[in-house]
C-alpha cells in the first residue's frame, strides 16, 4: 500500500433544500484506471462510511446501495454532492481515495471538509 | 419486523476475540440496516456498529474502531460482529437490531424496530 495526496475544501456550507457539493482531488503517480472513492463522516464519535464509488477513468461514478451522493469525476477529481442533509447531519466529511488498479494499490485520505447544515425556518402561516 | 436471536457471547481475557452472530427471520432481511448495540452495567445502551442493506457500507462507534468488523451474509439472513483486541470495558450485553430504512450519515439513530434478547460479553483480565 502506497501513500498518496487527497485534497479538498476545509468548509462547505450546504445549501437550504440540504445539499453539500465538494471536490476531492487526488495526486495519482500513475495511470490508473480503476478508482475507489469513499465519504466518511466523522462526527457524534462515530466513523461512517457516507457512500462509495467505484469508476474506471472516464466513465461515470457507479454508488454502492441507497446512496444519498452523486457525483462526476474529470482527471483526477472527483466532484461529489450529498443530498438530503439536515442541521444533525453537520461534521467531517472525509475524502478517501484508492487506485484499485493496475498495481500497485495507493491510498489516500483527505483531512476532510466540515460540512455546516442550516435547517431552513418554517414559512409563516400567510393570509394570502 | 424481523426476529433477531444473538449468540456468540461469553467470557474472555483481555486482548481475546469473540465473534458474535445474529440470525433473523420472519421478512425479507435485505430490506433492513442492522446495527450492534451494547449495555454494560449501570449505563445506557450504546451505538456499537451498523452496516448497510447490501453490506458495503458500514460505522462504527470511535470506541470499538479497528478493533471490530461488522457482516452481513444476506442469504443466510445473518449479521457478525467480530471483536478483537477485547478490552475490559466491552464487557456489556450486545444487542443486535434491524432498521427498515436505506442508509445515511447517522445509522446509530435510525429508527430500529426489531431487537433481539441480547447476549453477555464479559472481558477478564
Known amino acids: 500500500c502506497k501513500a498518496m495526496h487527497v485534497a479538498q475544501p476545509a468548509v462547505v456550507l450546504a445549501s437550504s433544500r440540504g445539499i453539500a457539493s465538494f471536490v476531492c482531488e487526488y495526486a495519482s503517480p500513475g495511470k490508473a484506471t480503476e478508482v475507489r472513492v469513499t465519504v466518511l463522516r466523522q462526527a457524534d464519535s462515530q466513523v461512517t462510511e457516507v457512500c462509495a464509488a467505484t469508476y474506471m477513468m472516464g466513465n461515470e461514478l457507479t454508488f454502492l446501495d441507497d446512496s444519498i451522493c452523486t457525483g462526476t469525476s474529470s482527471g483526477n477529481q472527483v466532484n461529489l454532492t450529498i443530498q438530503g442533509l439536515r442541521a444533525m447531519d453537520t461534521g467531517l466529511y472525509i475524502c478517501k481515495v484508492e487506485l484499485m488498479y493496475p498495481p500497485p494499490y495507493y491510498l489516500g485520505i483527505g483531512n476532510g471538509t466540515q460540512i455546516y447544515v442550516i435547517d431552513p425556518e418554517p414559512c409563516p402561516d400567510s393570509d394570502f | 419486523e424481523v426476529q433477531l436471536v444473538e449468540s456468540g457471547g461469553g467470557l474472555v481475557q483481555t486482548g481475546g476475540s469473540l465473534r458474535l452472530s445474529c440470525a433473523a427471520s420472519g421478512r425479507t432481511f435485505s430490506n433492513y440496516t442492522m446495527g450492534w448495540f451494547r449495555q454494560a452495567p449501570g449505563k445506557d445502551r450504546e451505538f456499537v456498529a451498523a452496516i448497510s442493506r447490501s453490506g458495503n457500507l458500514k460505522s462504527y462507534a470511535d470506541s470499538v474502531k479497528g478493533r471490530f468488523t461488522i457482516s452481513r451474509d444476506n442469504a443466510k439472513k445473518m449479521a457478525y460482529l467480530q471483536m478483537n483486541s477485547l478490552k475490559l470495558e466491552d464487557t456489556a450485553v450486545y444487542y443486535c437490531?434491524?432498521?427498515?430504512?436505506?442508509?445515511?450519515?447517522?445509522?446509530?439513530?435510525?429508527?430500529?424496530?426489531?431487537w433481539g434478547q441480547g447476549t453477555q460479553v464479559t472481558v477478564s483480565s
Open positions: 437490531a434491524a432498521a427498515p430504512v436505506p442508509w445515511g450519515t447517522r445509522p446509530s439513530t435510525f429508527p430500529y424496530d426489531s
